[in-house]
């Protein structure tokens, strides 16, 4: 999906008002210095591409974050503010949804959500030069 046509300011507002709090809740009990940020993004569409991938694509050691509250809210925000997102992304994840196992918070998942926090922070500061 091409995120260039999204309403970035509205997505930012949704992140600041609710998604960010759910990410913090998920990470509660974890030190902010525990994980190094290894995933980066260069502009807002790129950031959303990385956020989409890290939130909804299963990875080794972290089968699925998609049932977490922050993920459902992310999906809702993208569905609302990115025209065409629902048809291309959500229809494609319906089969995965049926196979999903129970939620398990592994260290790998915590690391992944830490990366997500970094991507979202970068998304919110698009004018900063890449480190």
């Amino acid at each position: 999906y091409d995120f260039t046509n999204c309403d970035f300011e509205k997505i930012k507002a949704a992140y600041l008002s609710t998604i960010s709090k759910d990410l913090i809740t998920y990470m509660s009990g974890t030190k902010s210095t525990e994980f190094n940020n290894t995933v980066s993004c260069s502009n807002r569409p790129h950031c959303l591409t990385e956020i989409q991938s890290l939130t909804f694509n299963p990875t080794a050691g972290c089968a699925s974050l998609a049932k977490e509250m922050f993920a459902m809210k992310t999906k809702a925000a993208l569905a609302i503010w990115c025209p065409g997102y629902s048809e291309t992304q959500i229809n494609a994840t319906q089969a995965m949804k049926k196979r999903r196992k129970r939620k398990v918070t592994t260290n790998k998942c915590l690391e992944q959500v830490s990366q997500l926090q970094g991507l979202w922070r970068r998304f919110n500061r698009p004018l900063l030069k890449q480190q």
Partner: antibody, heavy 120, light 111 residues
Amino acid sequence: QVQLVQSGAEVKKPGSSVKVSCKASGFTFGSYGINWVRQAPGQGLEWLGVIVPLVGVTIYAEKFQGRVTITADTSTSTAYMELSSLRSEDTAVYYCARGQEYFYWYFDLWGQGTLVTVSS
Amino acid sequence: QSALTQPPSASGSPGQSVTISCTGTTSDIGGYNRVSWYQQHPGKAPKLMIYEVSKRPSGVPDRFSGSKSGNTASLTVSGLQAEDEADYYCSSYAGTDTFAIFGGGTKLTVL
């Protein structure tokens, strides 16, 4: 049973406000959009706005901006639509309609409708 | 945002097919594959018949079909039955600030 149940008919004076409720049951209220659509006597359908409780987002049709307020109480699975500065042209049946999960613009479940009459 | 344009009436005999058109612009029908159709019987709430241009919700007979070409969407009812007599409304998404604009409605009469 999956349904939306709306509050009863209202008669209001011009210039006043009306608040219509819509109670959901049988589905996860927060995940869907709750849209409000009205239909004046003998006329077509007109979209007023939507609330997506999961993310607390409300979007209003430009025509009603500043005059309509849509809210939701997730603890009671109830959505509300308040329309202010009523005029005779606001006389209509007001429907709440569920927008499909993540496809909030398709209305797959409707309330029974609430007739609002604006008359002096 | 202007309403979508539908013919005020359409008719057909039982068993026949009838097609109802719905014309918009590149800002609504032409710009998105987010067209839906609703059936409304007198005194009742509307019912979703078609969504995403051509998909049918479960329980809707396959006699109802939808399509789109450019800025015009169409609803076809084949094998007309008496219970199909109703008002039909098309709807289109028109951007992140307008989730639905409706057509003026078409009264379908089964002769």
